[in-house]
C-alpha cells in the first residue's frame, strides 16, 4: 500500500479526531515531562501541517515518512537538554536511529507526581468550559505515565471518560454518579497499560515469534471452531498491530487495529460465534469488545491429540519439513482444546513438546523415544495447578490484604535488593490475584491467575532493568518469558544477602499518618514490612505477625489520641524499641 | 471437481528467477488457505510457502524466506509464486495445493523448475 503522502493516507483513514488524539498520545509517550500546553501546540502543528497535505500530496515535506515528521516536531523543543538530558542525542540522528534512540529512553516509572483528583463540581466545571481541552489532558496525562499504553485502546477510556461526565454532571448527586465510574476507569486503564506493557516486553525482548505464539494459544483458546489457518492470519495481523504501537507508530496501529475489526466482523462465520454483539458497536467500542470476546464453545467431535503428534509414525517427517507450522499447529490443536489452562502452560507445553522432537528425531528409534511425550506434561500442568489451589486457599483465609503482606514477606526475602516502592507496588498487585481470580469456577482460575501473574510480574522486570540490583530478577526475567512465573516461585530465601542496617528513620511515623485514605494507610505499613523483612531477612512469621500487630495497634492508639503528634513523638520510640528486641 | 493447474516452470540459470503460476477451478477458491510444495529429485516432499484467503501470507520455508513471494488474485482464481535469486538446490517440481483444515487436501500435476548453469 503505497501512498505520495502517508500523513494525509493516516488524516484521511482515521478522521481528525483520532489522528489528533494519537499523535498527542504519541508525543506524550516520547516526551514525558514536557507541559500539557507545549504538547498541544506541537500536534496543532501537525494537524495543520497534515490538512494541507490532504488539500496537495505533493506539497513540500508531505512525501515525508511519519516518523521524520514527527521527529524534526519533537525536536523543535527548545528545552530538550535541559529536561531530558542524553535523550537530547537522539536528534543529531537519522532516521530510523533516532527514533529507537526515542524509544529506549521512554521512562516505565516517569518521576511525575501521582495524579489528585479535584472536588467533582470543580472537575464539571471544567468539563463544561472546555470539553476538548479536558479530554485532552486526560490523555496527556494517562499516556506520560503509561508510555507504553495502546493507544487505540486510550482513545476508548477517553470516550468512556467523556460519556462519564456527560452523564454524571446532570446528575442530582454528581458524586455518587461519577466517582464509582472514574475509579472503575483508573483500575481498569492500569490493568489495560500493564497487560500491553507485557505484548510489548514480548516483542522487544523475544521477539515476535514469542508473540506469535502467544497470540496462537490465546486466540485458539478464543476461537476453538476457527481453522488453524484463520487463526494464523489474526496472529499475523494482530502481531502488525502491537508491533506498530509498540513501536511508536500509533497511527498505522490504530488504522491496523480498524482494519482487523473489519475484518473479524466480516468473517465472524469462519471465526467466532461469539463475535456478534461486538460487531454492532462503534468502532473504538468494538475493537475493544473484540479483544475481550469471551471463548466460543469447543467444538464437540475434536479428535485425540496423540494420534496426530504422538502415535503417527510420520511425526519427525511432517516436524523436519516445516517446524514452525507442525510446532504451531500443536499449539493451535492443544490450545483451542484447553481453555482451562494459562497461555503460559500452553507455551511452556509447546516448549517441552519442541524440544522432545528435537532429541528423539535425532535418536535411533525416534517413535519410541517419543511415545511417552503427553506423560512429561504432567509435571508441568500440575505445578500451576498446585500453585493456584494453595494460593487461593491461603488468600481466603487471610483476605486480601494479609494474603498481599504474605507475598510482600515472601518477595523480599527471595529478592531482598530491590527497592522497596517496587516490592511493595509489585507484591500488593500480586496478592490482587485473589480477589481477581479466586472466586472464578475451577476451570477459569488458571488462566486467570497465572497469565495475570505473567503481567505484574513483567512489572517488577521492566523497572528492575531501569535500575538493575538483583542477578536473581535479571535472570528470571531475561532467561525465558515463558518460564518467568515458575522461575520467581522457585527462588528461596537469599543467603547471600546481607542484612540492612536498623535506620530508626525508616520507622519513624506522624499525625499525617491518620488522615491518609485505607489504601495509604496500607501502603505506609506495607512499606515498614518490607523495611523489616529486609532487616531480619530470617525473622519469622509469627515474629513479622507480632511487629505487625503492635504497629497497628500503636498507629490505632496515636489517631485517637488528643495530641495525635505528642503521641507518636512518645509511642514511636518505644515501638521501635520492642520490635528490634521482638526480632532480635 | 477440484483442479489445480501449475505452469511457469523451465530452465532458469542460477541467481535467475521464474513465476509459477496455479489456475485453481472446481471449488470456492477465495475461500481456501493455498500453498506451494515442492519434491526435489530423490528427495521428500518440502512446504514452501502458505497463504490465507485474505492473501496474508501464513509461511515461508527458511529455505526461500526473502526469495520467494507467494500472492494471489480471487478474482482471477489464481495463486503464483515469485522465485527470485534461484539455487540449484530449488530445482523441484513444484506442487500447488489447496489447504483444508490440517493439511493438503488436493495437488496439482506440477511444474518442473531446473536451475542448472
Known amino acids: 500500500d503505497t501512498h505520495k503522502s502517508e500523513v494525509a493516507h493516516r488524516f484521511k483513514d482515521l478522521g481528525e479526531e483520532h489522528f489528533k488524539g494519537l499523535v498527542l498520545v504519541a508525543f506524550s509517550q516520547y516526551l514525558q515531562q514536557c507541559p500539557f500546553e507545549e504538547h498541544v501546540k506541537l500536534v496543532n502543528e501537525v494537524t495543520e501541517f497534515a490538512k494541507t497535505c490532504v488539500a496537495d500530496e505533493s506539497a513540500e515535506n508531505c512525501d515525508k515518512s511519519l516518523h521524520t515528521l514527527f521527529g524534526d516536531k519533537l525536536c523543535t523543543v527548545a528545552t530538550l537538554r535541559e529536561t531530558y538530558g542524553e535523550m537530547a542525542d537522539c536528534c543529531a540522528k537519522q532516521e530510523p536511529e533516532r527514533n529507537e534512540c526515542f524509544l529506549q529512553h521512554k521512562d516505565d516509572n516517569p518521576n511525575l507526581p501521582p495524579l489528585v483528583r479535584p472536588e467533582v463540581d470543580v472537575m464539571c466545571t471544567a468539563f463544561h468550559d472546555n470539553e476538548a481541552t479536558f479530554l485532552k489532558k486526560y490523555l496527556y496525562e494517562v499516556a506520560r505515565r503509561h508510555p507504553y499504553f495502546y493507544a487505540p485502546e486510550l482513545l476508548f477510556f477517553a470516550a468512556r471518560y467523556k460519556a462519564a461526565f456527560a452523564e454524571c454532571c446532570q446528575a442530582a448527586d454528581k458524586a455518587a454518579c461519577l466517582l464509582p465510574k472514574l475509579d472503575e476507569l483508573r483500575d481498569e486503564g492500569k490493568a489495560s497499560s500493564a497487560k500491553q506493557r507485557l505484548k510489548c516486553a514480548s516483542l522487544q525482548k523475544f521477539g515476535d515469534r514469542a508473540f506469535k505464539a502467544w497470540a496462537v494459544a490465546r486466540l485458539s483458546q478464543k476461537f476453538p471452531k476457527a481453522e488453524f489457518a484463520e487463526v494464523s492470519k489474526l496472529v499475523t495481523d494482530l502481531t502488525k498491530v502491537h508491533t506498530e504501537c509498540c513501536h511508536g507508530d500509533l497511527l498505522e496501529c490504530a488504522d491496523d487495529r480498524a482494519d482487523l475489526a473489519k475484518y473479524m466482523c466480516e468473517n465472524q462465520d469462519s471465526i467466532s460465534s461469539k463475535l456478534k454483539e461486538c460487531c454492532d458497536k462503534p468502532l473504538l467500542e468494538k475493537s475493544h469488545c473484540l479483544a475481550e470476546v469471551e471463548n466460543d464453545e469447543m467444538p464437540a467431535d475434536l479428535p485425540s491429540l496423540a494420534a496426530d503428534y504422538v502415535e503417527s509414525k510420520d511425526v519427525c517427517k511432517n516436524y523436519a519439513e516445516a517446524k514452525d507450522v507442525f510446532l504451531g499447529m500443536f499449539l493451535y490443536e492443544y490450545a483451542r482444546r484447553h481453555p482451562d489452562y494459562s497461555v503460559m502452560l500452553l507455551l511452556r507445553l509447546a516448549k517441552a513438546y519442541e524440544a522432545t522432537l528435537e532429541k528423539c528425531c535425532a535418536a535411533a528409534d525416534p517413535h519410541e523415544c517419543y511415545a511417552k511425550v503427553f506423560d512429561e506434561f504432567q509435571p508441568l500442568v500440575e505445578e500451576p495447578q498446585n500453585l493456584v489451589k494453595q494460593n487461593c486457599e491461603l488468600f481466603e483465609q487471610l483476605g486480601e490484604y494479609k494474603f498481599q503482606n504474605a507475598l510482600l514477606v515472601r518477595y523480599t526475602k527471595k529478592v531482598p535488593q530491590v527497592s522497596t516502592p517496587t516490592l511493595v507496588e509489585v507484591s500488593r498487585n500480586l496478592g490482587k490475584v485473589g480477589a481477581k481470580c479466586c472466586k472464578l469456577p475451577e476451570a477459569k482460575r488458571m488462566p486467570c491467575a497465572e497469565d495475570y501473574l505473567s503481567v505484574v510480574l513483567n512489572r517488577l522486570c521492566v523497572l528492575h532493568e531501569k535500575t538493575p540490583v538483583s542477578e536473581k530478577v535479571t535472570k528470571c526475567c531475561t532467561e525465558s518469558l515463558v518460564n518467568r512465573r515458575p522461575c520467581f516461585s522457585a527462588l528461596e530465601l537469599d543467603e547471600a544477602y546481607v542484612p540492612k542496617a536498623f535506620n530508626a528513620e525508616t520507622f519513624t511515623f506522624h499525625a499525617d499518618m491518620c488522615t491518609l485514605s485505607e489504601k495509604e494507610k496500607q501502603v505506609k505499613k506495607q512499606t515498614a514490612l518490607v523495611e523489616l523483612v529486609k532487616h531480619k531477612p530470617k525473622a519469622t512469621k509469627e515474629q513479622l505477625k507480632g511487629v505487625m500487630d503492635n504497629f497497628a495497634a500503636f498507629v490505632e492508639k496515636c489517631c485517637k489520641a488528643d495530641d495525635k503528634e505528642a503521641c507518636f513523638a512518645e509511642e514511636g520510640p518505644k515501638f521501635v524499641a520492642a520490635s528490634q528486641a521482638a526480632l532480635a | 471437481e477440484v483442479q489445480l493447474l501449475e505452469s511457469g516452470g523451465g530452465l532458469v540459470q542460477p541467481g535467475g528467477s521464474l513465476r509459477l503460476s496455479c489456475a485453481a477451478s472446481?471449488?470456492?477458491?477465495?475461500?481456501?488457505?493455498m500453498g506451494w510444495v515442492r519434491q526435489a529429485p530423490g528427495k521428500g516432499l518440502e512446504w514452501v510457502s502458505l497463504i490465507h484467503p485474505s492473501g496474508t501470507v501464513i509461511y515461508y520455508a527458511d529455505s526461500v524466506k526473502g526469495r520467494f513471494t507467494i500472492s494471489r488474485d480471487n478474482s482471477k482464481n489464481t495463486l503464483y509464486l515469485q522465485m527470485n535469486s534461484l539455487r540449484a538446490e530449488d530445482t523441484a517440481v513444484y506442487y500447488c495445493?489447496?489447504?483444508?483444515?490440517?493439511?493438503?487436501?488436493?495437488w496439482g500435476q506440477g511444474t518442473l523448475v531446473t536451475v542448472s548453469s
Open positions: 472446481g471449488f470456492t477458491f477465495n475461500h481456501y488457505t
Open positions: 495445493a489447496k489447504w483444508s483444515s490440517r493439511a493438503f487436501d488436493y
